[in-house]
């Protein structure tokens, strides 16, 4: 069975403070515990939540926590359920409220010698005790002319006279704490000789050179005096007006009239009423000069047909607040319909092409009127003037593809080539009218081109195929100077392309025919065995019917290709000694020799005193150092070919001779000794 070890118990609690309803359970198996408030399950919140089996309150709330709490333990497996004893809170609280007039029903009904009752709306539990104050001074019960009823929280003044006038407040305290009135009551019981306001002047806004009127009236017994002052405390009377208020008139009923108002007349006007007794009453009103600023410019707007769009008109700063309205074609827009004004917004619903045009936002107040135009374009889907056509473009020449469309606003045109966007560069240019220019047509430009013309309303596209008319050209052009190896077989290729496959033939530049051992096989000049006489100038001629012929001149040189007579060898030298790397090459034309050491060409003119290259090509290095170690390459070249060979150079320390070694002992590697 489920047993409660600790049960919740009813307890005192303070509003807004912490509290805990304890519940502890013992059961044969696991149980889950939940809480009920007035029979309904308690949902966890940040303020009130389960803490283990207990229910924790971060801040007790007199409204949400009133009622009966019960702890329920349930064994979900067996379904057994046990319930604790009921528990509730005795919540102590105090809450501030205003001082209100209970009797008479309204302030207007308060007259001298009537009974006035005020109520203090501070409430709490337990019921608090109350203290009343007038102008901050405590009122004690039983004083003349007033009684305090703590039960009803009332203060009664009987009869009420001018001496009771003042600011009434109350405070209350209980076991929970203290609170004072959140809003106090000003009791004003008039003395007939005190000036009272009958009509107070109001702020006015006038346009320049217009007139302004302030009304002001007081009453008292005997009648009070009335005086007008301007900002600088200058009195305004019909006899003595300040220089800047020459056009001011004070009427017998107290009203002040200002005519032809100028900026210097703007400011605060004070109307002062003084009774036989009591303080003067000062009423203030401000004269503002109407003003209106300029309106910000509108950006032109582009809308699409069928959509709904809004254009907001920000009213200019002004006094008084300018009124705003929209006009189109000189007619004010209605407040409903398809094209209408809503607040400061121009609304165009289900836009039609005919809605395009200039709309004007007007703003006006006493200071004048401002207006600002917005140009609205209704975008249309582009239509074709000229689609791109399948075209034959000549290689090497500029080519053009048209894409002429019209729409509102002016459409933007983009081109694609093989589905790839063409970005303008040195070869492609898109003109303002949409035409694509290919600056120098190449063979691979022969493909599909697509142009797309767009506006916000939509787009159209079309494609065309470009066929490139190839020019007659050598592919590739033959090298103007070529070498052939003496006494060997050699070939000189020549190929060309054109709109039609060209015929290719070779001839000697002097016009003489080719020797019998030289054959021309479909453009390839073939030498079975090169002789000295084969050197000379040759011409490759490519021709076809539509494009005529082209020629390429080739100078053939007969050469004996380079061979090395002497090659450098792997060399080891003692530090400080001299290294000799030999290299000799032969060929026709006679080859020149260059050396490369440590990955850089050794310039004979910048070698310094330690290095020297001999006429026969050998390299000598004096006073060798360890940093001279490395691979050295001998490069032999002439106008026909180039050849290289390399060998390493090792620089080693000279060993100290040992007694056991005889003077004739050879070193373990090839050594140059100098």
């Amino acid at each position: 069975a489920i047993v409660f070890i600790k049960q919740p118990s009813s307890q005192d609690a303070l509003q807004g403070r912490r509290a805990l309803l304890r519940c502890e359970v013992e059961a044969p198996g696991p149980v889950h515990v939940y809480w009920l408030l007035d029979g309904a399950p308690v949902q966890d919140t940040e303020r009130r939540f389960a803490q283990g089996s207990s229910l924790s309150f971060a801040a007790v709330d007199r409204l949400q926590d009133s009622g009966t709490f019960q702890c329920v333990a349930r064994d979900d497996v067996t379904g057994e359920e046990a319930r604790s004893a009921n528990a509730s809170f005795n919540i102590k609280w105090i809450e501030a409220g205003p001082v209100v007039l209970k009797h008479p029903a309204s302030e207007a009904e308060i007259q001298p010698q009537t009974q006035v009752t005020l109520r203090c709306h501070i409430d709490g539990h337990p019921r608090p005790t109350y203290q009343w104050f007038r102008d901050g001074t405590p009122l004690s019960d039983g004083q003349s002319n007033h009684t305090v009823s703590s039960k009803e929280r009332n203060l009664t003044l009987r009869p009420a006279g001018p001496e009771h006038s003042g600011l009434y407040s109350c405070c209350a305290h209980s076991a929970f704490g203290q609170a004072c009135s959140s809003q106090n009551f000003t009791l004003s019981i008039a003395d007939e000789s005190f000036a009272r306001v009958v009509l107070a002047p109001q702020d006015v806004v006038v346009a320049r050179y217009e007139e302004a009127m302030f009304h002001c009236q007081f009453s008292a017994q005997p009648p009070p005096s009335l005086q007008w002052l301007f900002e600088d405390e200058t009195p305004i009377t019909n006899r003595s007006r300040p220089p800047h208020l020459r056009r001011a008139t004070v009427f017998a009923n107290g009203s002040l009239l200002l005519t032809q108002v100028r900026p210097r007349n703007a400011g605060i006007y004070r109307c002062i009423g003084q009774g036989q007794r009591g303080p003067p009453i000062i009423l203030e009103a401000t004269l503002h000069l109407a003003e209106i600023e300029d309106m910000p410019l509108f950006e032109p707007r582009v809308f699409t047909a069928g959509s709904e769009e809004r254009v907001t008109c920000l009213p200019p700063k002004g006094l008084p607040e300018p009124s705003v309205w929209w006009e189109h074609a000189g007619v004010r827009l209605p407040t409903h319909g398809r094209v209408y004004q809503k607040g400061h917004e121009l609304v165009l619903a289900n836009i039609a092409e005919s809605d395009a045009g200039v709309y004007t936002c007007h703003a006006a107040n006493l200071a004048g009127q401002r207006r600002q135009d917005v140009n609205i374009t209704v975008a249309t889907v582009p239509s074709w003037l000229k689609k791109p056509q399948d075209s034959q473009l000549e290689e090497g020449k500029p080519g053009y593809l048209d894409c002429l469309t019209q729409a509102t606003p002016k459409p933007t045109v983009v081109w694609y080539r093989n589905q790839m966007l063409i970005s303008e560069d040195s070869r492609f240019e898109v003109f303002k009218n949409g035409t694509l220019r290919i600056n120098s047509v190449e063979v691979y430009d022969g493909t599909w081109y697509r142009c797309m013309s767009s506006t916000p309303a939509g787009s159209i596209e079309a494609q065309a195929r470009v066929q490139v008319l190839e020019k007659l050209k050598f592919t590739p052009p033959p090298q103007p100077q070529q070498c052939m190896e003496f006494d060997k077989e050699a070939t000189v290729p020549c190929s060309a392309t054109g709109r039609e496959k060209p015929t290719i033939k070779w001839e000697r530049a002097d016009g003489s025919s080719l020797p019998e051992w030289v054959t021309d096989n479909a453009g390839t000049l073939h030498f079975a065995r090169v002789t000295r006489d084969d050197a000379g100038n040759y011409t490759c001629i490519a021709s076809n019917g539509p494009q005529g012929q082209i020629r390429a001149h080739v100078q053939l040189t007969v050469a004996v290709f380079i061979t090395f007579k002497v090659e450098p060898e792997r060399t080891t030298v003692y530090q400080g000694h001299t290294a000799l790397l030999q290299c000799e090459a032969q060929g026709d034309p006679k080859p020149l020799i260059q050396w490369k050491g440590k990955d850089r060409i050794l310039d004979p003119t910048k070698l310094g005193p330690r290095m020297h290259i001999f006429q026969n090509g050998s390299l000598v290095i004096h006073d060798v150092a360890p940093e001279d170690s490395g691979r050295y390459t001998c490069i032999a070249g002439n106008s026909c070919n180039i050849k290289h060979t390399e060998a390493p150079l090792y620089v080693v320390d000279k060993p100290v001779p040992e007694e056991s070694e005889g003077p004739g002992s050879p070193p373990p590697y090839k050594m140059i000794q100098t």
């Epitope: 696991p30 889950h32 939940y34 029979g39 399950p41 949902q43 966890d44 389960a50 329920v72 349930r74 064994d75 979900d76 497996v77 067996t78 379904g79 057994e80 359920e81 046990a82 319930r83």
Partner: antibody, heavy 112, light 110 residues
Framework: EVQLVESGGGLVQPGGSLRLSCTAS????????MNWVRQAPGKGLEWVGI???????YYASWAKGRFTISRDTSKNTVYLQMNSLRAEDTAVYFC??????WGQGTLVTVSS | EIVMTQSPSTLSASVGDRVIITCQSS????????LAWYQQKPGKAPKLLIY???NLASGVPSRFSGSGSGAEFTLTISSLQPDDFATYYC??????????FGQGTKLTVL
Amino acid sequence: EVQLVESGGGLVQPGGSLRLSCTASGFSLSNYVMNWVRQAPGKGLEWVGIIDSSGSTYYASWAKGRFTISRDTSKNTVYLQMNSLRAEDTAVYFCARGLYLWGQGTLVTVSS
Amino acid sequence: EIVMTQSPSTLSASVGDRVIITCQSSQSVYHNNLLAWYQQKPGKAPKLLIYYTSNLASGVPSRFSGSGSGAEFTLTISSLQPDDFATYYCQGGYNGNIYAFGQGTKLTVL
């Protein structure tokens, strides 16, 4: 022996009502919570509602308004009152004490 | 409305396999642990396997285990036996005495 026996199932027309009973033996209902669960043919289990030890009832959102759980502790019986029945209410209805003890179920068929 | 989602809906496995079924709730269960697992065979009432997320019901083999917290839970069968081929359901309990079942996972022989 502790056991639950459901009864009251059968054929009922759409729009009709039916009251199912779950009779408990071997324990007293007043100390236990009782669940009703249903299972449509070939479908999964669906929780209908619960009556706790104090007699308070709680329902699945879809069951509120049409289905009512009650009990008679003197007869040690829990009831499921079903109104405005629909074809989709066709199922085997189980009563269960907690998670462990289940009845054998009773078939309710709603059909015209 | 509370929704409990089991995955997978159907599962094919062989004897000896390790099987994991997951259950996800649209909101946290009460006390983060009020979740049970059932096994049901055709024509029979459901049988309780696991309660309070990880407690083994009496008579249930130790190859069944449960884990999880809040809104995500798993049932694990460490080594599948021939008797384990059935449909498995998760059931969550929520604040306010509300309960809900998952849609079920049918475990079949591969």
